[in-house]
Structures are given as structure tokens and as C-alpha cells.
Amino acid sequence: DAHKSEVAHRFKDLGEENFKALVLIAFAQYLQQCPFEDHVKLVNEVTEFAKTCVADESAENCDKSLHTLFGDKLCTVATLRETYGEMADCCAKQEPERNECFLQHKDDNPNLPRLVRPEVDVMCTAFHDNEETFLKKYLYEIARRHPYFYAPELLFFAKRYKAAFTECCQAADKAACLLPKLDELRDEGKASSAKQRLKCASLQKFGERAFKAWAVARLSQRFPKAEFAEVSKLVTDLTKVHTECCHGDLLECADDRADLAKYICENQDSISSKLKECCEKPLLEKSHCIAEVENDEMPADLPSLAADFVESKDVCKNYAEAKDVFLGMFLYEYARRHPDYSVVLLLRLAKTYETTLEKCCAAADPHECYAKVFDEFKPLVEEPQNLIKQNCELFEQLGEYKFQNALLVRYTKKVPQVSTPTLVEVSRNLGKVGSKCCKHPEAKRMPCAEDYLSVVLNQLCVLHEKTPVSDRVTKCCTESLVNRRPCFSALEVDETYVPKEFNAETFTFHADICTLSEKERQIKKQTALVELVKHKPKATKEQLKAVMDDFAAFVEKCCKADDKETCFAEEGKKLVAASQAALGL
């Protein structure tokens, strides 16, 4: 499979348009602060060079690895030292250390301005004036803010982004057509970014084995009719794709993802009956569709798992011969029978099974020792079931905003050292589990809820890793990937926390709050709630709810006032004074 010129090979496989887009994404994900024009210039230079290699694979430098070519190009940026500080030191290293160095400097929370959406007419004019630049700018802005965004999927988003403008800029009511589509793309994009971030964290922090275990469980749920060998092949290929994308090898990743989609569609009959529609679509849509495809029906009359994994006298022999293969088969068999379980639960069960075999296969009577292993699964299954039941009841009682507030209080009390913006962002996302998953029937609730929570808690983990402030967060994030959620759930109020000093400025509000969107207004209120809990961690739920209700009434009253600013100043002081007196701030 060796090619004289890797860059020529990828250019020919992907085509010029995708090649340029993927190089732009790669560069923007590495150098997140560089201006758009600088990246476009670098991409054009790389593209021109790739074309010379396509014409003559033996031309000078065409035999160099993509990391060498791209790294050399990134290191030509004049302002590297003043813009990125110590990242510039990466350029003194040789490959592969240089690329590893660039990867380590990816910033999950870059200091970039919030993307403000211009007026629809302004956007449509820009789209018509220069469609290519407009779409490149989209790729650039998303990639630099989401340095682990799944690159081939970002091409799919860009295609939908283009389609939205093509359709809506000709519509009678441009805004009514365009804005809902852009909102949908934004929300789906954030979700896609967070899901991919978990895959990369899984690979980078816990290794290939952890990712493969996750993939075996998920693909076995999705393709329960496929043989174990087929699932194993898909897992191997999928692991390669994600390892490449998470490692910044975006051209190889996109190419291999296309090959995997092609293979899946050519072998639908032995994989899943649900793939037919997906496989009729063009490449980007096809890959996206396969990744989101619903679970196939379980084969009828699957035998009991106990026969092969508990009752058989060959359990320890089979385990000893090929431990990971045997555990993989256990995970495959369990997962295909349980689309109603979360992937992380299935992985906990597999880990329990592995631990039991490790202990029992060394015992005097192995069978006697592991005979009751399935009984150990019961509490592991019941814990997430009960938690989801309780939280869905709370969500249905409170609604999303107040459910988020309950989680804000809960998590601020658990880990009050975490920054307020991170607590607000993470708790708001945790709270979205209600509207996302509680509407589902029992059989779909757990996979929806617990696997979503894994994605959100990973956001907390990657944000906290940048500036660690809490040993408890570090512990829950690093000890076990599959036990992160139970670890956070088990955290009680941090009794060692010293309450934050009271700062009146934190609780001072102005008339600008009246012009904010409902979402932004909620975030302001939730920010105040977190700060309140940090000042008064012993405040009861009732007291905190009362303060929030007072705050809502205060904002409503002052936003209706003739002199809003005076109202905010005077009534704000009174509210702080009343809260201080009642809570002893």
C-alpha cells in the first residue's frame, strides 16, 4: 500500500476540493489564533505543491510524510512565538515528536470571540459575492473553536451550510428559511464536536484497547445480526479512522472513512438490514447516515449467555488462550442482546466479568468461584436505571431551566473550585439530558441518557485538565473512563471548601440584560446562582430557589421600568441586602 508520494496519493483519492478543505481544517485546528487569510495562503501553497507531486511523484520533497510537509508549513508562520508562546518550541523538534507537540497544544477552550451571526441580508450578500471564501470561513471558524471536530463530518456540515444558503437566499422570507437551519446546524455541530472529543479522549487518555471495547459494544448493539468476526473487522477499521483524525492525520482519516463506508455498503447483507437507504446517498451523507443508523432488530432465539460464559467447563481455557478475544466475544454477545443498556454499562459488566475471571481462573475450583458472576451485574444495572428514573421525574416536575438549576447547585456543591463558566456550561448540558432522553420509552432511556452524560462529563474533564483546580474532578476523570458518571454521581458536598468572599459586583446587574435572548438571560441568572452557592455552600435548596425567584422578579420588574438603569441599581442593592440578611452572606 506504499506510495512514492503520500501527498499525491491523498490529493488524487480525495480530489482538490476535499483536499483543500481538510488541510484548512487541519491547520485551523493546530494554529487556532491565526487569521483566516494566513491559513488560506498556507493551504494554497500546500495545494500547489501537491499538484506538482501529482504531476511527478519523484519531484523534490514529494516523498516526505504529510506530518513533515504540514509541520514545515506551520513552522513558517512568522508570528508563531508571540501568538502561541511555547508552542513555537515544537518547531525545534523532529517528526514524530513535532506533531505530538502540536497536538498537546490544542486548546479546548481557546480565547476567541463568540461567533456573532450577522443579519441575514449581510450573510446572503457575502455568500453570493464569494461562495468559496464564505464556506472556507465557516470551516475555519468551526475548526479553530473545535480543534478535535471530526474533519470528514465537518465537510458534511459545510455541505449542509452551503445548501441552506443556496436555498434560503432565494426565498421570499430569507430569515424564516435560514435561521432555523443555522440553529439546527449550530446545535448539531456542538453535539458532534463533543461526541468526537470523547472518542479522542478515550484514545489519547485510555488507549486503543479502551476505544476498541467501546466500539465493540456500540457496533454490536447497532448490528446485532453481524457475526463477531465482522464486528471485529469494523472495529479495527473504525479505530484506525478515529486514531488518524484524533492525531491530526485528517487526509488519511477522511480517505479511510470513505473506504469503510464503501466496505459497509458492499457488505450490507452480513452487517445490517437498516443500511439500504444510507448506502444510496452520496459519500458525505452516506458516512453520516451510517454513523447515525438505528439499531437493527435482534436475531430471534439467541441462546442464553450463561452457557458459553458461565456454565461451560472451558471458560478459563478459552479465556487463557486469548483473553481480549474472549472478552470481546462476551461484550459482543452481551451488547447485541441489550440495546436497552448504555455502552458504558456494558463496559462495566465486561470489566466485572474480566476481574472475576482473573480471580477465579487462578482459584482451586474456578467454576464454583465464577458461577454467580451474573448476579454481580444486577446492582450495576439497577444503579443507572434508578438514577435515570429519579432524574426524569425531577425533569418532568421542573422543566429544563429549573432542572438545569438543580444540577448547577448539585455540581457546584460537589466541585466548587471549578470555574463558574465551566460549571454553567457543563450543568446546562447535563440538564439537556431531560428533553433529549426522558421522552423515550424505558428501553431507550438508558443508552440515550448515560452515553450522553459521558459526553458531557468529558467536556468537564477536558476543560478541567487545562487548568486543574479540583483533585476530585481529576480523580473522577482519570481513574476509569466507564466509571466517570458514577464517580461524579457519588460525590457529596465538598466539606473542605472555604466559601468564596462576597463580592457585590458579582451580583450587580444592568439594563443590558433586558435586551438579551432568553438563553443569554438564563445564563446570566445561572452564573449568579453558581456564584451564590460558592459564597454560601450551606444554603438550602429552598433558600436558593427563593433567591432565584427573587432575581427573576427583580429582572422582570426592572425591564418594565421607565428608568431601567436606576431600577437595576436601586432594586439590585435591596435584593442583595435582603439575600445577605436572610442567608447571612
Epitope: T540, E542, Q543, K545, A546, V547, D549, D550, A552, A553, E556, K557, K574, L575, A578, S579, A581, A582, L583
Partner: nanobody, 123 residues
């Protein structure tokens, strides 16, 4: 003159329902959070429920959650407490209170108090 007048109390059987009313006058009703408190013989006065100036913002003591519902009608300057599935433990004098801040209400403080209405639940 500020007045809060409670009505609707009485003697009922366990499991029955009652609806208490609190009629306010002499102040700008819509600017105040309203709470219901109760005091059983020989016991301290305790918080039952409250409604903020924004009618949807309510809260309840754990003992009454799911059984009692508080609501307000600003046009009539009245607050209601719908009490269902009453228990003998609910026997008390029920007081209505008005306060500028919810946070003071939950700590048992208020600007204005009513005289109370007796609720007796027999088993």
C-alpha cells in the same frame, strides 16, 4: 390600612380537600411574594408554600409537596392554597403572609401577616 384575611378553613376528614383563600388590601399586591405558614398546637410556626410575584415561581415544604397547590390571582388580590389528600398532621392554624422577597419568606420573615384560619383534619 394593610390587611390579609384568610378564609376557607374548617373541619374535614382525612383524605378530603379544602381550599384556603387569602384576600389582600392596602398595598400593591402584585409586587409581593405571598406565603402560607401553619402552626399546630404547641409547635413553632412552619413554612408551607409560597408564590413569587411571577406566578409560576412556587415552592412547597416537603411535607405538602404533591398534595398542596398555591396560586395567585392579581386581578382579585387573592392567593389560594388548594389542599388535597389532607392528613391529621395537617391540623393547624394557617396564616397568610406578604413579603417583598421570597428569600425572607422561606426563613419565616414577612412584612405583613394575616390573623389565620383553623384547619382540623380528623381521622
Amino acid at each position: 390600612e394593610v390587611q390579609l384575611v384568610e378564609s376557607g378553613g374548617g373541619l374535614v376528614q382525612a383524605g378530603d380537600s379544602l381550599r384556603l383563600s387569602c384576600a389582600a388590601s392596602g398595598f400593591t399586591f402584585s409586587n409581593y411574594a405571598i406565603g402560607w405558614f401553619r402552626q399546630a398546637p404547641g409547635k413553632a410556626r412552619e413554612f408551607v408554600a409560597r408564590v413569587s410575584t411571577i406566578a409560576g415561581d412556587t415552592d412547597y415544604a416537603n411535607a405538602v409537596k404533591g398534595r398542596f397547590t398555591i396560586s395567585r390571582d392579581n386581578a382579585k388580590n387573592t392567593v389560594y392554597l388548594q389542599m388535597n389528600s389532607l392528613k391529621p398532621d395537617d391540623t393547624a392554624v394557617y396564616y397568610c403572609a406578604a413579603e417583598s422577597y421570597n428569600v425572607r419568606l422561606v426563613t419565616g420573615e414577612a412584612d405583613y401577616w394575616g390573623e389565620g384560619t383553623q384547619v382540623t383534619v380528623s381521622s
